[in-house]
Structure formats: C-alpha cells, structure tokens
Interface confidence: low
C-alpha cells in the first residue's frame, strides 16, 4: 500500500487562533478527526470539499477539523483567540516568493514584469486561451493572479490586459533571493522551509521521521516555528531536519544579507581589553590560552582539524590566532598549537565588570569620566555640543561643559540610572550606556538631603471630570493585546504613553500589539461605546534591570469618562507602611467559567526588611522595589496581570506606585508581592515623556 505523504509541513501554524467569518456567504466544512495531520492531508488534496481549501482550524477539544476556502488575509474574515484552536494556513497562499519554477505559487501578484495588469483566467478578452480554471483543477487559476500551471521555465506568468501583449512572466522573486541572514543566521527568523538540495523541512513540533530534542516549548527563544530553517546551536548556518527518512538534517540555502548588519539587540558589545558577558564580542589580540600555550590559527587545520573557520563564522572575527567565542561557550577560547590539547579557555582575559579604572561608575555616575561612546543598544553617541539645546530643555542648571567632551557617555542631569548620551537617532533621542556600577559601591543613587521622607503625592487637589472624581474610575487601566489576545496589563500615564513590563513583549514586531483602553471586560463585550483601540508605535525599555517599558501609542488616547491617565509619584518618595493599595488586572486563568471582568485585590505596603523575612530570606529587596501584602493572612492571590499597576492613595490622590512583573509572586499568604517601585524610576519616565516625540492628536 502506498504510504500517504504527510502534508502538514505545507502549512503555517498559528497556535490558539481561529478564523471567524464576518461574511456569511463564505463556506466552511467540518468533520470529526483525531489529528491535525488528517485535516492537513484532506485540505491539501481537497478531497470531498466543495471549495479549494486554503486553511483549516483544528479544534483540539472537540477533535474536529474546520476547513476554509479563505485564510487570515482574505476579506470578510477575522482572527480570534481560542485556547483549543490551532490555525493552519497553506503556505502557498500566503507566500510572496517562488520556489523553483513557481509551479506551487498561489499568491496574489497580478501584474507582469513590465507592469501590465493581468487578464482574468476565466476571461477570453482580450486574449482567447485554453487555460480554463476547470481544465487545470488544483492549479488555482483564480482571478487574474500570476500562475505557472505547467511548470514552465520562466516562472509564473499571465495573459495580459494589453491586446498587443498576449502573455508575459511576472516579476516574483525566488524565496532564496528574498530570504537572507546575517552572520551564521543565529538570529534568522525567516520563512525558508526547504534545504539547499530542495528537501522539505520537518516541523520542529513533530518527531517523525526524525526524533529530536529541539522542541519549541523547550527552547521558546529559538524561533522554532512550523518547519522553517533555524540555527539554534551555533552551526555555520541555518539548517533543519528533513522529511526524507534517509537524511536526518541538511543546511538551507539562505544568502547573506547585502547590508550585513545585525539587529541592535543581537550585537554583542565589542571589547578589546576585557570580556563582557560570555565574551562573544571580544575582539582583542590575546592569542594564548590561560596557561600560556599559543593558539592555533583559525584558518589552519593543524594540529587540530575543525570547522570553526573564518568562512563558516563570518561575523565572529576569527582572525589570526586570537581568542574568540564564536559558538556561545562560557568565555573566549581557541584551538591550541599543542597536539595533545585540542582547545583551551583564555581565562586570563579580565572581565570588564571586574576591571578597574573607568569601566564602572560610582553612585549615579555623575563623575564618570571614561571614554565609552556607545549606548546599550549599540548606537554611537552623538557629540554633546550638538545637543546642548536639548539638554537645557530638561535640566534647570548649567551643565559642567568641561565634563561633556566629545561624545563620551556622561551624566550631566544627575540621572539616577547612570551615564547616558544622545544618539542622533530621532526615534531614540538618547539612551543609557552599558556601564555597570563599580562592584561593592553602596552609594545610594537616590539622595534626598533636604527631605528625608518625600511624600509620594503631588500637592494638588483631586481632579474632577464632568463632576465624577477620577479616583472612582479605572480609566487608566490598559489591556495590552498580543496577536488579538490579552497578554498584559498597563497604566495610561500620559495620552500617548503606557507604563508596563518588559516581559509583555514576546515578539519584536510592533504590528503584533494593540492597546485597548476604556474596557471593563477583557474581550471588550459591552464596552463598544467606551473602548479605544490604539496601535503601538515604539517600546522604550527602562534602565537596566528595571523590567519596565514605556509603550508609545501610535496616536494619543482621547481622555473621556472612560479613559483617563493616572498620576506618577514624586521621584524617590516613600509611602508609609500599611498604606492601603490595590492591584488591578484581568488575571486570565484559562478556566471555562472565567468571566473576563477586571478584578481588584487589596494589599497594604510592607517595609522591605519585613518583606524579605516573609520570603524566607530568598530575596533581598533593593531601592528599586516595593512590597505589598494581602490585608488578611490567608487571603487568596491577587489576580493581576504582568505590567499592571499597584495603585495607592495618598492625600486623596491615586498614583501608580508599583508595576507587576513576573517572578515575584503576589499576596500569597505570608508571601507578599514584590513590585517594581515606580518612584525610583519616576525621573526616567518624565525624561522619556519630555524628550521622545509623540504624534499630535
């Protein structure tokens, strides 16, 4: 009996997602089955379906397939979150490039190479032809889209709408041209799904035909989506397991991007004298291992054969015989010239954090005079003398010009979080520099000499909107949506700014996010009149270790009876112990009877020492953290969301004093919650709001 091919690899999976048809004319076919693979096979073969299947949803709870003649890009359709659903879309219908001759291309390009609009396949005007959709079933001769039903050399083509030009090929690029990678492709997250010899890749979430350990849930940061080529383990370039039982894995043909730059976040900070982190950015000239044995040249295979060559690891600077860390080892290393010792670590290179001199700062770094001139995201600092006007705009004293030389990282405004610089990039006007506080430095960064205890509330009276005191509503509460589902809470602190947590952003693509304001129900049910849905235009990450993010909205929120801002506390303020506070959140539990309504839990402020005792000494709190416990011992957990606020009231004024972040728990009996202390970061927040441009309403 002929073994049926497994076709699920031809589909792009979106977990916990389904499609809802808004247009009632669209058809759907359903059937009980056991696995998503069965759904895929039927969709691919169109067996027993009254339409061309472009996508399907597998309902894991009901063990049911829903086949669709549309996909998420079709009109009259919307995506919706659903725990029990997985959406699979045929890649051929969403791909915008061709593989080989483009026989399987089913995209929507409908213009020829010279720019002529295509003639519909079902039309005989202006050109009569025999390529009827009914004669070429399965070739998707729909509308006037470019196709290659016979697999001819030139790739997809069409009859043209110009009577003078019968047919012409379309300018659709090869997927191997579109896809490109930097360095050895460790950060590659593209859609190449076949190997250099043309074999289709095996899905990472499948164990057939090859069993493997690279499971998406085990390595969530490796981008193991569908069956796309990846480089999770420091290979020379991306690879995948193949569907050929006789070929376990193979490299993929992905070219190096012409502009061979990496994303800022992927660039290890380059150092020449010392090791930062694991030393992946070390570019110095030490060329012996720890005990003095000289290193073997990277481009030599003697005395040790290896594949760590400059050709295989293009961005790792494998020059001469210098110590390097091309593969994510614990520190720089090299092959040695001793035939009996294959490799050795160059552990004599000092750690930047340990090195003395100006590689660290004391206090808040206002006296730092080192010569680092790069921000933590790798941007080059711009000259101070070009930015004096901006600097004067947010400080109220004359900066010490003698310190502001060249473009070195400095702290002219007494920033609590260390040296920084201007960047010259209009999107990121300034940022902190990657310098740590000196080891053992205990100088407090918040110095309040005049006022030993600063009140958190500003001394203004409670504002009233349309006669309703704002403290009675929770209009500042934001639901951050990720791919159409609620993922985190947040607080609207200004019309264009939401304060939330760093952990709320699993994807770098801002198109994946929306902010919902003015809602009480997490799904927006019954909130249609008051709901505002805003796109996200930028994420500004907080100072190192803060876990905070300021999320800039694509347009300002409209403040009304349902949407309002919440106040920030004074910088460095202290809130008295036992102050009554609340945490808010939708606290989605995944339960069937979950009502989706915003919840509140009442907590009280607890001193840091007492808080540490309640955590069995496991955590030491610092000045950037604030602790709050349940009012009654034994009361249940607070049902907040990451990014959501700890809101306290002082002098009849409500303020966001804390932000919920993962890994600290909240209001467990005897185990109080630890929040990011907003007062510690208040100056940073004000500085961002003042210096970053926002769209006008």
């Amino acid at each position: 009996q002929r073994k049926r091919r497994n076709t699920i690899h031809e589909f792009k999976k979106s977990a916990k997602t389904t499609l809802i048809k808004i247009d009632p004319a669209l058809k759907i076919k359903t059937k009980k089955v056991n696995t998503a693979d069965q759904c895929a096979n039927r969709c691919t073969r169109n067996k027993g379906l009254p339409f061309t299947c472009k996508a399907f949803v597998f309902d894991k709870a009901r063990k049911q397939c829903l086949w669709f003649p549309f996909n998420s890009m079709s009109s009259g359709v919307k995506k919706e979150f659903g725990h029990e659903f997985d959406l699979y879309e045929n890649k051929d219908y969403i791909r915008n490039c061709i593989i080989g001759k483009g026989r399987s291309y089913k995209g929507t390009v409908s213009i020829t190479k010279s720019g002529i609009k295509c003639q519909p396949w079902s039309s005989m005007i202006p050109h009569e032809h025999s390529f009827l959709p009914s004669s070429y079933r399965g070739k998707d001769l729909q509308e006037n889209y470019c196709r290659n039903p016979r697999g001819e050399e030139g790739g997809p083509w069409c009859f043209t709408s110009n009577p003078e030009v019968r047919y012409e090929v379309c300018d659709i690029p090869q997927c191997s041209e579109v896809e490109c990678m930097t360095c050895n492709g460790e950060s590659y997250r593209g859609l190449m799904d076949h190997t250099e010899s043309g074999k289709i890749c095996q899905r990472w979430d499948h164990q057939t035909p090859h069993r493997h350990k690279f499971l998406p849930e085990r390595y969530p940061d490796k981008g193991f989506d569908d069956n796309y080529c990846r480089n999770p383990d420091g290979q020379p370039r991306p690879w995948c397991y193949t569907l050929d039982p006789h070929t376990r894995w193979e490299y993929c043909a992905i070219k190096t991007c012409a502009d061979n730059t990496m994303n800022d976040t992927d660039v290890p900070l380059e150092t020449t004298e010392c090791i930062q982190g694991q030393g992946e950015g070390y570019r110095g000239t030490v060329n012996t291992i720890w005990n003095g044995i000289p290193c073997q040249r990277w481009d030599s295979q003697y005395p040790h054969e290896h594949d760590m060559t400059p050709e295989n690891f293009k961005c790792k600077d494998l020059r001469e015989n210098y110590c390097r860390n091309p593969d994510g080892s614990e520190s720089p290393w090299c092959f040695t010239t001793d035939p009996n010792i294959r490799v050795g670590y160059c552990s004599q290179i000092p750690n930047c954090d340990m090195s003395h001199g100006q590689d660290c700062y004391r206090g808040n770094g206002k006296n730092y005079m080192g010569n680092l001139s790069q921000t933590r995201s790798g941007l080059t600092c711009s000259m101070w003398d070009k930015n004096m006007e901006d600097l004067h705009r947010h400080i109220f004293w004359e900066p010490d010009a003698s310190k502001l030389n060249e473009n070195y990282c400095r702290n002219p405004d007494d920033d609590a979080h260390g040296p920084w610089c201007y960047t010259g990039n209009p999107l990121i006007p300034w940022d902190y520099c990657p310098i740590s506080r000196c080891e053992g430095d205990t100088t407090p960064t918040i110095v309040n000499l005049d006022h030993p205890v600063i009140s958190c509330a500003k001394t203004k009276q409670l504002r009233v909107v349309n006669g309703i005191p704002t403290r009675t509503n929770i209009g500042w509460m934001v639901s951050l949506r990720y791919r159409n589902k609620h993922i985190c809470g947040g607080s609207l602190i200004k019309e264009s700014w939401v304060l939330t947590a760093r952990q709320c952003f699993p994807s770098r693509d801002l198109k994946d996010y929306e902010a919902w304001l003015g809602i009480h129900d997490v799904h927006g049910r019954g909130d249609e009149k008051c709901k505002q849905v805003l796109n996200v235009s930028q994420l500004v990450y907080g100072p190192e270790g803060s876990d905070l993010v300021l999320m800039k909205l694509a347009r300002p929120a409209v403040l009304d009876d349902f949407v309002s801002t919440i106040d920030l506390p004074n910088y460095g303020c202290t809130i008295p112990e036992k102050t009554s506070c609340s945490v808010y959140g939708w606290g989605y539990t995944g339960l069937i009877n979950y009502d989706g309504l915003l919840r509140v839990a009442h907590l009280y402020i607890m001193g840091n020492e007492k808080c540490s005792q309640h955590h069995r000494g496991k955590v030491t709190l610092n000045e950037s953290e604030i602790c709050a416990g349940a009012e009654k011992i034994g009361s249940g957990p607070c049902e907040g969301d990451y990014g959501g606020p700890l809101v306290c009231e002082q002098h009849k004024m409500r303020m966001v004093l804390g932000v919920i972040v993962p890994g600290r728990g909240c209001a467990i009996p005897n185990r109080p919650g630890i929040f990011v202390r907003v007062a510690y970061y208040a100056k940073w927040i004000h500085k961002i709001i003042l210096t970053y441009k926002v769209p006008q309403s």
Epitope: V583, G663, G665
Partner: nanobody, 121 residues
Amino acid sequence: EVQLVESGGGLVQPGGSLRLSCAASGSILGINAMGWYRQAPGKQRELVAVINSGGSTNYADSVKGRFTISRDNAKNTVYLQMNSLKPEDTAVYYCNADEWGDYPGQVYDYWGQGTQVTVSS
C-alpha cells in the same frame, strides 16, 4: 508539575569538594527561584543558596565564598559547587523550586527527595 531529582551527594573529607545537581522534569524556564536547602540532624531546614531566573544569586553567610550556585536552562538543571567543605556542612541537601503561575499570586513550591552530604575524616 515539576519533579526535582538531586544527585552528587556522598562522603568527602574536610577541605574536599562536591558538586550537587538537581534536574527538573519539565522546563525550568517558568521557574523564578531555584535553590538548595539543607537539614542537619535535629536542626531546622536552612537556606544554602538560591538563584533566580535572571541569574541573581543569594547565599547563606556560612557558605559564602565556598559554595557556588548556577543553573543551566537548556538542561533544566541547577548545580551547587561545594568547595572547602567542613564537618558542619554535613546534612541532607534538598533542591527547591518556586514556580510562579500565569498571573501574579499563583506560586508552586517544589522539593526534591534530598541527597546526603557527609564531611568526615
């Protein structure tokens, strides 16, 4: 649910070294703090060392400078490297993990079965 299995205990002479391992079934990526506690006969269980998901560590004063805790997320394992061991380090060593749930307030405390460390000449 996370299961913790300790290994590496044994008999060692004063001044010697041991490396304890604690392997977690399931992923430790969702776990905030993983740590080692010990209980000597007739004494309370006490914290030895703890490491959180960001790599920050905390040690009991009695072991500072001698013991090092580390974790390997890829191997779902936390280690305790014990150097310059003393007779007073003799105890049953327990691995502990705090797993925080999907939202603040859900916390699960997991314990291993323990591994015996005896320091004696």
